[in-house]
């Protein structure tokens, strides 16, 4: 006789997901000699762990407590990038610009970016039909609880000058429900960070429009402002030529505004 | 069985560019990383780069920066190495090459090579 | 860069007796993790080199026992307890510790 199987919203757990974290593990250690020390069956079983047997709408952060032990991991404090709406220009620029790091960039970041996964409670299972959808079924998710937790633990790493990469094509630019606006702006230090520069990236081509001025960035300055920490914010106005210009600063058309 | 096959052997002008493929199978092209490197005639061994498949992010050697690019068609499962600004002292035998993983841990040796094309700059 | 130094750069071997090479690295390639990161490789004419030994000592799968390698940080030894005639080639040390990997110069084993 089948078992019910609860249908959630969304869509389910991402296909080769075992196979695919503990290869991404290895790939990891393989790429990030200093992280060498990580056993990645360990990781593997920290990670299952967090989520296996239990309901998928009932996933707190100490759950992942092990897992984020066991991925604890040094980045420079002073050389973080945020992003909000904008994961493949921040990823782009982190490429060229090695010596910054965005969270996905880190071990467990890399690990889970773009997968979805849960279980089922009391089961052993991996659900590969459905998981909760934040929205639509709840928040306490295992995929949402995951990315809150790392992120909050990243943001709080920060120190000095934190730089944040923002979409100014979107509606909101800074949106006061995405990561970045409900985890990561709460969870700067202000006895360790100074300053939260946003890049604002534009989209269209003739845009020249400066949407520092916009309300939801007059919105974020407010908020940082708050936390006594200081708030710049740059246009760059061409994405493309922003990163030529990282790869070839010493191009002599990059002299000019971006 | 894991087998990396390259393409054919190219004979091009200095200032030319070339692009070697290296066609993987028998495993799951995304889980490893892919490893270029050269080798001059009678000469030794020289590491040109990695990339990852999944993600496209990429490592070159500091003496080959700006002149080298590698890519992934993860349909075709398939890695490209492009040289651009061919000089002479670029005729070597390219190689892919991947690692194997012992237990959930990467060797740290390269396991598994393509058998090499040869690349000829010549005026 | 980790720069990797082999001895003797030929050798010349007769056929059942014991051959050995000598391969240095200007630093230590012990990692935190208890591993040491050093390869042993063989090259034969016309062909990709083919691993023989990862982490100083572990050897390759499929490789014969007679291959064996030890050291210590900087200071690496491959053995061959027996030379047959299909062990001629050249044979590069590699350090994985850290990026950029790095090879030895090369070791050619001639049979007498």
């Known amino acids: 006789v089948p078992r019910w199987r609860q249908q959630w919203s969304g869509p389910g757990t991402t296909k080769r997901f075992p196979e695919t974290v503990l290869a991404r593990c290895v790939k990891y250690t393989e790429i990030h000699p200093e992280m060498r020390h990580v056993d990645c069956q360990s990781v593997w079983d920290a990670f299952k762990g967090a989520f296996i047997s239990k309901h998928p709408c009932n996933i707190t952060e100490e759950d992942y407590q092990p897992l984020m032990k066991l991925g604890t991991q040094t980045v420079p404090c002073n050389k973080i990038l945020l992003w909000s709406r904008i994961k493949d220009l921040a990823h782009q620029f982190t490429q060229v610009q090695r010596d910054m790091f965005t969270l996905e960039d880190t071990l467990l970041g890399y690990l889970a970016d773009d997968l979805t996964w849960c279980g089922e409670f009391n089961t052993s299972k991996i659900n590969y039909q459905s998981c909760p959808d934040w929205r639509k079924d709840c928040s306490n998710n295992p995929v949402s609880v995951f990315w809150k937790t790392v992120s909050r633990r990243f943001a709080e790493a920060a120190c000095d000058v934190v730089h944040v990469m923002l979409n100014g094509s979107r509606s909101k630019i800074f949106d006061k429900n995405s990561t970045f606006g409900s985890v990561e702006v709460h969870n700067l230090q202000p006895e360790k960070v100074q300053t939260l520069e946003a890049w604002v990236i534009h989209g269209g081509r003739e845009d020249s429009r400066d949407l520092c001025q916009d309300p939801t960035i007059k919105e974020l300055e407010s908020i940082i402002s708050k936390r006594n920490i200081q708030f710049s914010c740059k246009n760059i106005y061409r994405p493309d030529k922003f990163l030529q210009c990282v790869k070839n600063p010493e191009d002599s058309s990059c002299t000019s505004e971006i | 069985q894991v087998q990396l096959v390259q393409s054919g052997a190219e004979v091009k002008k200095p200032g030319a560019s070339v692009k070697v493929s290296c066609k993987a199978s028998?495993?799951?092209?995304?889980?490893?990383?892919m490893h270029w490197v050269r080798q001059a005639p009678g000469q030794g061994l020289e590491w040109m780069g990695w990339i990852d498949p999944e993600y496209g992010s990429t490592d070159y050697a500091q003496k080959l920066q700006g002149r080298v690019t590698m890519t992934t068609d993860t349909s075709t499962s398939t890695a490209y190495m492009e040289l651009r600004s061919l000089r002479s002292d670029d005729t070597a035998v390219y190689y892919c090459a991947r690692v194997a993983i012992i237990t959930t841990v990467a060797s740290g040796g390269f396991a598994y090579w393509g058998q090499g094309t040869l690349v000829t700059v010549s005026s | 860069d980790i720069v990797m130094t082999q001895t003797p750069l030929s050798l010349s071997v007769t056929p059942g007796q014991p051959a050995s090479i000598s391969c240095q690295s200007s630093?230590?390639?012990?990692?935190?993790?208890?591993?040491?990161?050093l390869n042993w490789y063989l090259q034969k004419p016309g062909q990709p080199p083919q691993l023989l030994i990862y982490w100083m000592s572990t050897r390759a799968a499929g490789v014969p026992d007679r291959f064996s390698g030890s050291g210590s940080g900087t200071d690496f030894t491959l053995k061959i307890s027996r030379v047959e005639a299909e062990d001629v080639g050249v044979y590069y040390c590699q350090q994985f510790l850290e990026y950029p990997p790095t090879f030895g110069q090369g070791t050619k084993l001639e049979i007498k």
């Open positions: 028998g495993y799951t092209f995304t889980d490893y990383i």
């Open positions: 630093e230590s390639l012990l990692h935190s993790n208890g591993k040491t990161y």
